[in-house]
């Protein structure tokens, strides 16, 4: 229904706390360089204005759209051009072009320092001093670094953070209580960020239809007892929620997500038998829980998929009458039978099925033509299954760090022109798939591996889009979203690449590396490894292992030495010489 004042409506629906949190996230995602204090001031002004509209919906400007209200606030920020350059040009436009312009200026890789977690004691002191301001800083710091983070989900992570601090700051050993818990939240939040960015990419590049297909497959796997009409309704609603969040309409997104959670909990009987525990939780936890609820038990009496989609004499007629609905039912039926497949694979199969019908229904004898379509799915299914087996075997053999290094070598050979920091980040993220997925039961591995890899590769594509340097990467990133992972997997050594000349300074290290945390040490070593591959793209695994073992030994020796600086300055050049010889 239409409301006289949109801002009053959203304030009433969401409540002050969530309203303020979402407005802070929205501003932080649009203007990523502004400080927390600057944004907090704007949030307070918007909230005060919303309250006047709640009191009197006819008050001045209360009838304006949220984009107009928020955009006007952002455009009133002093020194906008000095701090944000051409983003300031957005302010010369009218809505809806102005909001589109802001969206286009979101930076997926902002030049902000990595957020270092402060010491436990200091965190607890400042959290106790002002929990609201502390959590505001958390929202701001995450949102500006992840401009497409799913806003209602970020509120959920902030709530988790708050609960952890409340619990651990009361403990004697705050550090050992906080560290594992906050590490867990951070890991989950980072995965959530790349997954949501993938959804927004799908929406931006291929439109709502592509996202809705993703949603149908995912929901059908999770709720195999729901009928097609129910799945379609859920997919339509979920598409709307995601479109709003990806489009910066965070208040609407959070409000609609709450409505969707409410609907699901009120209609459990027709959706799934697994929802009750989620539905007993408060709002943020409920919506989060529903988004990752376990798959319902598959109906025992499902007929073979071939009956309706291959053997039926009316296949072409049914397809011609309503293509999207027919393909939707195929995707639904296939997905509910295959919780063990990745969504990407299910969408590739649906695409193959569509292409087969397009070709065969134009021929003289369609059934003879499309009769083998299910058999033609086999290679498409085998490819990711083999990928999972090969990579999980390698992960089990090498462990996470060694597996990351193997991926780093592989991807540096595929795209040596890509910057070393991007390659290292990508390889570290891709390598985490082992820890995340390879320990799962067999039937959960494939969906976990492939859908996670697809999300990470989407980030590689976004970073590469900014400064395209590799034709290999451009080729894989230009195609459809579901074909990206197979495309990257199929890439081999880039034969067009002219190896980098050997620079001794790239492999020169100083004693400060000894005091770095383990993660930073790994990144330094992985940076050196990528540079080695760029110097010798065709180096064998054995050669690279020799060099890296030597390098690790050198670090170990010099970091244990009484005079570290002398050790690094004398042994370092010897290491560089040995490396050159080993790779000659």
């Amino acid at each position: 229904e239409a409301h006289k004042s949109e801002i009053a409506h959203r304030y009433n629906d969401l409540g002050e706390q969530h309203f303020k949190g979402l407005v802070l996230i929205a501003f932080s995602q649009y203007l990523q360089k502004c400080s927390y204090d600057e944004h907090a001031k704007l949030v307070q002004e918007v909230t005060d204005f919303a309250k006047t509209c709640v009191a009197d919906e006819s008050a001045a400007n209360c009838d304006k759209s949220l984009h107009t209200l928020f955009g006007d606030k952002l455009c009133a920020i002093p020194n906008l051009r000095e701090n944000y350059g051409e983003l300031a040009d957005c302010c010369t436009k009218q809505e809806p072009e102005r909001n589109e312009c802001f969206l286009q200026h979101k930076d997926d890789n902002p030049s902000l320092p990595p957020f270092e977690r402060p010491e436990a004691e200091a965190m607890c002191t400042s959290f106790k001093e002002n929990p609201t301001t502390f959590m505001g800083h958390y929202l701001h710091e995450v949102a500006r670094r992840h401009p497409y983070f799913y806003a209602p989900e970020l509120l959920y992570y902030a709530e988790q953070y708050n609960e952890i601090l409340t619990q651990c700051c009361a403990e004697a050993d705050k550090e050992s209580c906080l560290t594992p818990k906050l590490d867990g939240v951070k890991e989950k939040a980072l995965v959530s960020s790349v997954r949501q960015r993938m959804k927004c990419s799908s929406m931006q590049k291929f439109g709502e239809r592509a996202f809705k297909a993703w949603a149908v497959a995912r929901l059908s796997q999770t709720f195999p007892n729901a009928d097609f009409a129910e799945i379609t309704k859920l997919a339509t609603d979920l598409t709307k929620v995601n479109k709003e969040c990806c489009h910066g309409d965070l208040l609407e997104c959070a409000d609609d997500r709450a409505e969707l959670a409410k609907y699901m909990c009120e209609n459990q009987a027709t959706i799934s038998s697994k929802l009750q525990t989620c539905c007993d939780k408060p709002l943020l936890k409920k919506a989060h829980c529903l988004s990752e609820v376990e798959h319902d038990t598959m109906p025992a009496d499902l007929p073979a998929i071939a009956a309706d989609f291959v053997e039926d004499q009316e296949v072409c007629k049914n397809y011609a009458e309503a293509k999207d609905v027919f393909l939707g039912t195929f995707l639904y039926e296939y997905s509910r039978r295959h919780p063990d497949y990745s969504v990407s694979l299910l969408l590739r199969l649906a695409k193959k099925y569509e292409a087969t019908l397009e070709k065969c229904c134009a021929e003289a004898n369609p059934p003879a033509c499309y009769g083998t379509v299910l058999a033609e799915f086999q290679p498409l299914v085998e490819e990711p299954k083999n990928l999972v087996k090969t990579n999980c075997d390698l992960y089990e053999k090498l462990g996470e760090y060694g597996f990351q290094n193997a991926i780093l070598v592989r991807y540096t050979q595929k795209a040596p022109q890509v910057s070393t920091p991007t390659l290292v980040e990508a390889a570290r993220n891709l390598g985490r798939v082992g820890t995340k997925c390879c320990t799962l039961p067999e039937d959960q591995r494939l969906p976990c591996v492939e859908d996670y890899l697809s999300a990470i590769l989407n980030r590689v594509c976004l970073l590469h889009e900014k400064t395209p340097v590799s034709e290999h990467v451009t080729k894989c990133c230009s195609g459809s979203l579901v074909e990206r992972r197979p495309c990257f997997s199929a890439l081999t050594v880039d034969e067009t690449y002219v190896p980098k000349e050997f620079k001794a300074e790239t492999f020169t290290f100083h004693s400060d590396i000894c005091t770095l945390p383990e993660k930073e040490k790994q990144i330094k070593k992985q940076t050196a490894l990528a540079e080695l591959v760029k110097h010798k793209p065709k180096a064998t695994a054995e050669q690279l292992k020799t060099v890296m073992d030597d390098f690790a030994q050198f670090l170990d020796t010099c970091c244990k030495a009484a005079d570290k600086d002398t050790c690094f300055s004398t042994e370092g050049p010897n290491l560089v010489t040995r490396c050159k010889d080993a790779l000659a």
Epitope: P118, E121, A122, T125, E129, N130
Partner: nanobody, 116 residues
Framework: EVQLLESGGGLVQPGGSLRLSCAAS????????MDWVRQAPGKGLEWVSS????????LYADSVKGRFTISRDNSKNTLYLQMNSLRAEDTAVYYC?????????WGQGTLVTVSS
């Protein structure tokens, strides 16, 4: 790497005012309590003032109470010390310090000379 850079010191007459600044980098400034510490010529270190993460709590040495005001701007990662009614005994090198946490970090100091 943590860096603290003080500025604003100089020569001032008794009864005059100065405002010291400390630009912080290399750590999450808004989470930490910050302090000012001074060292008069030939003397030991003397704690002057401290401020909590969000500025809600401030503490002062008795010798400066009512004359000095500590403040911070978390959006600029900067700590301040407003010094009024300066006396000859306030002459010292003033250090900005991050004393909470596992390690202490100090700036290189800024010299304040109060003399007629």
């Amino acid at each position: 790497e943590v860096q603290l850079l003080e500025s604003g010191g100089g020569l001032v007459q008794p009864g005059g005012s100065l405002r010291l600044s400390c630009a912080a980098s290399g750590f999450t400034f808004w989470v930490y309590q910050m302090d000012w510490v001074r060292q008069a010529p030939g003397k030991g270190l003397e704690w002057v003032s401290s401020i909590s993460a969000f500025g809600a709590k401030t503490l002062y040495a008795d010798s400066v109470k009512g004359r000095f005001t500590i403040s911070r701007d978390n959006s600029k990662n900067t700590l301040y010390l407003q010094m009024n009614s300066l006396r000859a005994e306030d002459t010292a090198v003033y250090y900005c310090a991050k004393l909470s946490g596992k390690f202490d970090y100090w700036g290189q100091g800024t010299l304040v000379t109060v003399s007629s």
